[in-house]
């Protein structure tokens, strides 16, 4: 070993070196939280970059760059360090127009904490392992969601566009002429029935057990879907999103009420099955796999 490499190894294995890097990262994080940093922080920024560069150089000199088995770039944690340094120099010395987007990458410096604290490193390692183990469960989840999304697509396609339409028109107005002119919120409120405080027109359906319109209104299929057009089963992707919403129980009772009002109460069965299978079974299966992965990592 050359003297330079021996010194580098000594520095690298010293506890004070780890402490210095740790303090640098924490101080750097504090500086990053500043709203309007004063001009002198620019020099502090250069100091941080210098310390990170020094750390990487020490590691490269001690372990080698990338040829051997235990070299600098063979450790995934060092990739993060390398990216941080590259972006630090890029944003500082290369004129790349919209630098603010690149400055975002400075936040990666906070992630360097993980590689310095041994406990955190273990937990993140377990997290990565659990994600690997989750692949099969994820495939199963996506498959189940896809199947139910396709069923939802067949059962409820277009249903959430059913609205209660006013039964009195001007002489020159027909349903189609109104459909072609509906634009503003004001237009919608003029022709459709809205419950007090509601941002969407009252939903209805054509089957006997679906929601009926009040007197003076008729159920028609016009306009956009509820919630600014985001809630629907009109395409596979929207249906998939709706099913994901059911699985995660994200305000699912609203989707349930909307769909049952538009399609009919019979379809409650669909929601019962989805909630039991997707929300109770699959979510807990995911949690079980994550718990197992942590257990294995701890052992």
């Amino acid at each position: 070993f050359s003297p330079l490499r021996r010194i580098s190894i000594k520095i690298l294995v010293h506890s004070l070196f780890s402490m210095l890097i740790m303090c640098t990262i924490l101080t750097n994080c504090i500086f990053m939280t500043m709203n309007n940093p004063p001009d002198w922080t620019k020099n502090v920024e250069y100091t941080f970059t210098g310390i990170y560069t020094f750390e990487s150089l020490v590691k490269i000199l001690a372990r080698g760059f990338c040829v051997g088995e235990f070299t600098f770039l063979r450790d995934p944690w060092n990739w993060l360090d390398f990216v941080v340094i590259v972006f630090a120099y890029l944003t500082e010395f290369v004129n790349l127009g919209n630098v603010s987007a690149l400055r975002t990458f400075r936040v990666l410096r906070a992630l360097k904490t993980i590689s310095v604290i041994p406990g955190l490193k273990t937990i993140v390692g377990a997290l990565i392992q659990s994600v690997k183990k989750l692949s099969d469960v994820m495939i199963l989840t996506v498959f189940c969601l896809s199947v139910f999304a396709l069923i939802g697509l067949q059962l409820f396609m277009g249903n959430l566009k059913h609205k209660c339409f006013r039964n009195s028109l001007e002489n020159n107005e027909t349903l189609e002429s109104i459909m072609n002119t509906l634009e503003s919120e004001e237009d919608f409120r003029k022709y459709f029935y809205y419950l007090e405080g509601s941002k969407d027109a009252l939903l209805c359906g054509f089957s006997t057990d679906s929601g009926q319109c009040p007197e003076g209104y008729t159920c028609v299929k016009i306009g956009r879907n509820p919630d600014y057009g985001y809630t629907s089963f009109d395409t596979f992707s929207w249906a998939f999103l709706a099913l994901f919403r059911l699985m995660t129980q994200d305000y699912w009772e609203n989707l349930y009420q909307q769909t049952l009002r538009a399609a009919g109460k019979t379809y409650m069965i669909f929601f019962v099955v989805v909630i039991f299978l997707g929300s109770f079974y699959l979510i807990n299966l995911i949690l079980a796999v994550v718990a197992m992965a942590y257990e294995e990592q701890n052992q």
């Epitope: 039964n167 009195s168 028109l169 299929k221």
Partner: nanobody, 124 residues
Framework: EVQLVESGGGVVQPGGSLRLSCAAS?????????TGWYRRAPGKQRELVAR???????NYADSVKGRFTISRDNAKKTVYLQMNSLRPEDTALYYC?????????????????WGQGTLVTVSS
């Protein structure tokens, strides 16, 4: 293809009567907002004659008020236009319009569905 069946047109003398029928008997017709009669006289634009909403309330063009009566038979899914005291200016092609929702089998569709038209000629 959605079809409305119109009947009852013909030639009649001024002051005479006619009864037009519009049957939306196909199972495709689910629910209307209104079903109405429109007419197009030679060289003129199509205009509303009368319409009846699903709850029974009606609209008439000013020129036919008191002479024409629109009614419906929900069981037969048919709308009638009783035309009395006919005048030469009533001569036109009368169209039936179902403005509402149909079923394509796969989905519901709302819009305007027109008949082929039935000719009414008032002349002496």
């Amino acid at each position: 293809e959605v079809q409305l069946v119109e009947s009852g047109g013909g030639v009649v003398q001024p002051g005479g009567s006619l009864r037009l029928s519009c049957a939306a008997s196909s199972r495709q017709f689910i629910r209307d907002v209104f079903t109405g009669w429109y007419r197009r006289a030679p060289g003129k634009q199509r205009e509303l004659v009368a319409r009846i909403y699903n709850e029974g309330n009606t609209n008439y063009a000013d020129s036919v008020k008191g002479r024409f009566t629109i009614s419906r038979d929900n069981a037969k899914k048919t709308v009638y236009l009783q035309m009395n005291s006919l005048r030469p200016e009533d001569t036109a092609l009368y169209y039936c319009l179902f403005s509402g929702t149909i079923s394509t089998g796969r989905e519901y569709r709302s819009g305007d569905y027109w008949g082929q038209g039935t000719l009414v000629t008032v002349s002496s």
